[in-house]
Amino acid sequence: NCDRGLRPSCPNSQSPVKVEETCGCRWTCPCVCTGSSTRHIVTFDGQNFKLTGSCSYVLFQNKEQDLEVILHNGACSPGARQGCMKSIEVKHSALSVELHSDMEVTVNGRLVSVPYVGGNMEVNVYGAIMHEVRFNHLGHIFTFTPQNNEFQLQLSPKTFASKTYGLCGICDENGANDFMLRDGTVTTDWKTLVQEWTVQRPGQTCQPILEEQCLVPDSSHCQVLLLPLFAECHKVLAPATFYAICQQDSCHQEQVCEVIASYAHLCRTNGVCVDWRTPDFCAMSCPPSLVYNHCEHGCPRHCDGNVSSCGDHPSEGCFCPPDKVMLEGSCVPEEACTQCIGEDGVQHQFLEAWVPDHQPCQICTCLSGRKVNCTTQPCPTAKAPTCGLCEVARLRQNADQCCPEYECVCDPVSCDLPPVPHCERGLQPTLTNPGECRPNF
């Protein structure tokens, strides 16, 4: 019984969670593994260490669930001394979903749009900065925020601990066995652990990150983690691990920001939002039309509708204002979701038909999903009309006209023109049929 049972103290500084089971309720420590500040890993049981190269690493593996998560690291930019998280690859059954640092998502190497649902996996985007992969049937949630060099693997509380392997360790509330190698033996040396779970992609070479460590400790900015600003979060998640990591990297501005962002993310996951960024300190810049919010509730609103479920916890990032929804990376009014954009840039309503400029033989229709369907209209065989005297039938096609038409045009060459009469007493002959081809006087 959870009300009477002892609440455990969790080794990863997390707050224990209730797990309702058939035989009652029990307390357990959440299985959360985080990566932050470019290279720091905090295991399920709270051990922490640094990745030392731009390479690929197995973070988490569960053979029983046919699930594997791989982190791909690389230089932040060509020749850069810093390493960055380039992508997170989630393999499940026959699917390989890769979340890239440029916020693109590929499934088995093919680019897909988000939200994406497939093979028991759901992918959502939050605040234009964070991707989330949910396994509703397993209860796992994985997130990747490349802008902060941060990932979070949150396993279902019902996960059978001993079936997890990789750099994130074994979630069994025992930090001593987190550094487990593939053969089941445990090492105390984190460098051996990292080496063990390093995998090489075809054509990729693993290179050490030659980042210069901090020689002068000045962790004044890390103090933010200990301020009353985070007091509510301190109640659910002790900041000690993150403060220690921050102090190690205090001379690198991005890394200080990344560590604090990672702690703030865990706070949000636990229901506590902290507005810690300022214009002068770790500011997050948003693309045009989006606005920053440190605590956005509800599902991201996309034109495609909410085809997948999403987390009930708040998120940070760049969002559309309340009256707008996301469409291809920018915010649009909701009515724009059903509108189609023609080649000329003109908006057309759902089921509206139009003839595009300079393509008079096409008729285009705006269908659902903002798809434009254009068909070419066939031309009937043109029939030559019966023309009047001195007229000949000729085919004509204007630029804005699809099918050619016959028209009667004057043909003086083939015409028997009457003589112009000679008038007396200074009178002039007058035309009795102006506009016609054969004049009458």
């Epitope: 210069e212 901090c214 020689l215 002068v216 400790p217 000045d218 102090q247 690198h252 501005q253």
Partner: antibody, heavy 113, light 112 residues
Amino acid sequence: DVQLQESGPDLVEPSQSLSLSCTVTGYSITSGYSWHWIRQFPGNKLEWLGYIHYSGTTTYNPSLHSRVSITRDTSKNQFFLQLNSVSTEDTATYFCGREGYHWGQGTTLTVSS
Amino acid sequence: DVVMTQTPLSLPVSLGDQASISCRSSQSLVHSIGNTYLHWYLQKPGQSPKLLIYKVSNRFSGVPDRFSGSGSGTDFTLKISRVEAEDLGVYFCSQTTHVPLTFGGGTRLEIK
């Protein structure tokens, strides 16, 4: 790679103020690290004067605190040392540096009337 | 202030010999975050000091592996396994754990 270059006068009169500049190339002084001024007296003794953090905060050697000031111009990627009320004892080679990894070549200053 | 005492003041060696320089601090250099910020520099005539070893035992990039650092708390040592001509100059230890940052008085490595 990062490079630092000191510049300033060769000679300053006693009781005057000394101003030195350090121009940094290859790295932004607002991106990270602390940026230091150190001096070396004739006879090799090294003395740390102070630093300006990438965030703009400063830390000084208490023995010089009332006389020393370090500022920066982020648009030019430069930081500066000002030492007031100099005396002949401030005759030294002045170095600027990043953390301790990289130092400039130094500029030699003589305080003399 | 933390006083850094280097010994010897001068160290005459033959090329190929091992050299050892000691540095002692007046108080512990272990920072509250667990790191020990003790570093070693080499200064050649007319040049600025160049970093050799940082945080007691880490070789800076490009520094030959004949240089090694060791020690803890208040006692530290720099060793050169086989002295080469390019190693001659003045060696300084430095601590950045406490403000003000301080330097040792220097050890001149010279040919016997």
